[in-house]
Each structure stands twice: as structure tokens, then as C-alpha cells.
């Protein structure tokens, strides 16, 4: 699996992907905000 995430439970895998997506969205917003403020 591409980024080293390992879990034996499919629902846990889906949860991990959801958390990753949320963090990507939050970090993306912060990055955009920083660029905007420059």
C-alpha cells in the first residue's frame, strides 16, 4: 500500500483515509491562508 498504512480491518482503513483527507484539507487551507497573507 502506497504510504505504509497498515491495518487488518477494512473499516479502520477507511477511517484512516478519512482522517488523512481531513488533515489534507486543513493543511491545504492553512497553506492558502499563508500565501494570501504574504
Amino acid at each position: 500500500h502506497s504510504d505504509g498504512i497498515f491495518t487488518d480491518s477494512y473499516s479502520r482503513y477507511r477511517k484512516q483515509m478519512a482522517v488523512k483527507k481531513y488533515l489534507a484539507a486543513v493543511l491545504g487551507k492553512r497553506y492558502k491562508q499563508r500565501v494570501k497573507n504574504k
Epitope: 500500500h1 502506497s2 504510504d3 498504512i5 491495518t7 487488518d8 480491518s9 477494512y10 473499516s11 479502520r12 482503513y13 477507511r14 477511517k15 483515509m17 488523512k20 483527507k21
Partner: antibody, heavy 117, light 112 residues
């Protein structure tokens, strides 16, 4: 309504590779879990692996590890399953399927891959 | 891997009679999220499978209420309360709780 349309039937020689495509429409492609399942003639179903296109994150069945590669092109809403080192036992109908609620809610029409010398 | 054992392999039932298919898993399918990812599929000749039941007992929208799923842990049942001609198909259970996802061998339902 989600629709999955797969590429046409293929005839391949032993030792070669095959790449099957699955084009999705009617949903948000990047935010789905796209699975591949195969069915040998007159046999049951066998899970091969999945991809989560938003991160291109993949998970493969142990049986196919090292021989299967699942990819996705978000720009065309298309997933691909490539199986290498083909043998006669790989003759099967290959299906793509989309997960909803932890279960395969939508299926492609299937692609018959025949491996024969 | 989780082994899914379906029984019987085939079943001949008269129209209007009850058909019962059993499915047993080698490990509990109850997930840490409280859900049981046991699913039932129907497959007619030359067609892709179709989802009938998920979460062990939740019927897919549009599926007739003569189809019902029950069970928990490792033992599950699909019941067709009154068999219709259009129900002739192969039925598969499969588990989506644990990697690798695994399927039962299928049960062929025919009319007696």
C-alpha cells in the same frame, strides 16, 4: 446513479500482462473505494484489491501481491487493474466495484480475460 | 484470511416456498465500529453480482422484502420467504470486516 463501464474482452498469452479499465460516472470518483474482484468460469468470486483515488492509496490481496497493480486517473474518472505474469488460471471475468457503506453497491459489467497459448 | 463457508451448495425449492441459505465465518465479523460487515449478493447468469443485503440485515433499496438477512458474530442466514421465478440465481455471502475481503463459495437456488 453511479455507473461503471469496463473495457472489452482480451485474449492474452501466458507470461504477458493485461490492463483492464473501469470508467465511473455519476459520482465523485476521487472519494470512493474502487475494488477489483474476479470470477473464473463457473467459479466463485475473489477479491484482488482496492484503490482510494484521492491519495492513490492501494491495498492488495496477499494472493496477488507483486503481480497486480491498481491505478486511477482522476482526470478521466477511470481506474485500471493490471495483472502480470498471466497463466491459464487467470482466465476469468474481472469486475470493478465501488464501496458504499462497507459493501460493493455498484459493479461494472465485467471484462473477460482469456489466457491461452 | 477469513474463511466463509456457505451451505448448501445448491437448493431446489418450490415456487412460493421458503429458501434458507447459511453462511459461517471462521472469525467474528463484528467490527470495532459496532457494525457487522456481512453482505449478500445475487448473481444471475451472464450478469455482474447485485447487492441484496449489507450490514448482515439491511436490505438494499429496491430489493423485495421477501429477502431478509439475519445473524451475528460468525453465523448468518439469507432467507427468501416466498420463492419467485426471478429469484433463480447464485447467492454469495462475503465479509468486508477484515482484509483480505473474502467470499463464500455460493449457493445455487433453483425451482423444484
Amino acid at each position: 446513479e453511479v455507473q461503471l463501464v469496463q473495457s472489452g474482452a482480451e485474449v492474452k498469452k501466458p507470461g504477458s500482462s493485461v490492463k483492464v479499465s473501469c470508467k465511473a460516472s455519476g459520482g465523485t470518483f476521487s472519494d470512493v473505494y474502487m475494488h477489483w474482484v474476479r470470477q473464473a468460469p463457473g467459479q466463485g468470486l475473489e477479491w484482488m484489491g482496492l484503490i482510494y483515488p484521492i491519495f492513490a492509496d492501494t491495498r492488495y490481496a496477499q494472493k496477488f501481491q507483486g503481480r497486480v497493480t491498481i491505478t486511477a486517473d482522476e482526470s478521466t474518472s477511470t481506474a485500471y487493474m493490471e495483472l502480470s505474469s498471466l497463466r491459464s488460471e487467470d482466465t476469468a471475468v474481472y469486475y470493478c466495484a465501488i464501496d458504499q457503506d462497507g459493501s460493493f453497491a455498484y459493479w461494472g459489467q465485467g471484462t473477460l480475460v482469456t489466457v491461452s497459448s | 484470511d477469513i474463511v466463509m463457508t456457505q451451505s448448501p451448495d445448491s437448493l431446489a425449492v418450490s415456487l412460493g416456498e421458503r429458501a434458507t441459505i447459511n453462511c459461517k465465518s471462521s472469525q467474528s465479523l463484528l467490527d470495532s465500529d459496532g457494525k457487522t460487515y456481512l453482505n449478500w449478493l445475487q448473481q444471475k447468469p451472464g450478469q455482474p453480482p447485485k447487492r441484496l443485503i449489507y450490514w448482515a440485515s439491511t436490505r438494499e433499496s429496491g430489493v423485495p422484502d421477501r429477502f431478509s438477512g439475519s445473524g451475528s458474530g460468525t453465523d448468518f442466514t439469507l432467507t427468501i420467504s416466498s420463492l419467485q421465478a426471478e429469484d433463480v440465481a447464485v447467492y454469495y455471502c462475503w465479509q468486508g470486516t477484515w482484509f483480505d475481503l473474502t467470499f463464500g463459495g455460493g449457493t445455487k437456488v433453483e425451482i423444484k
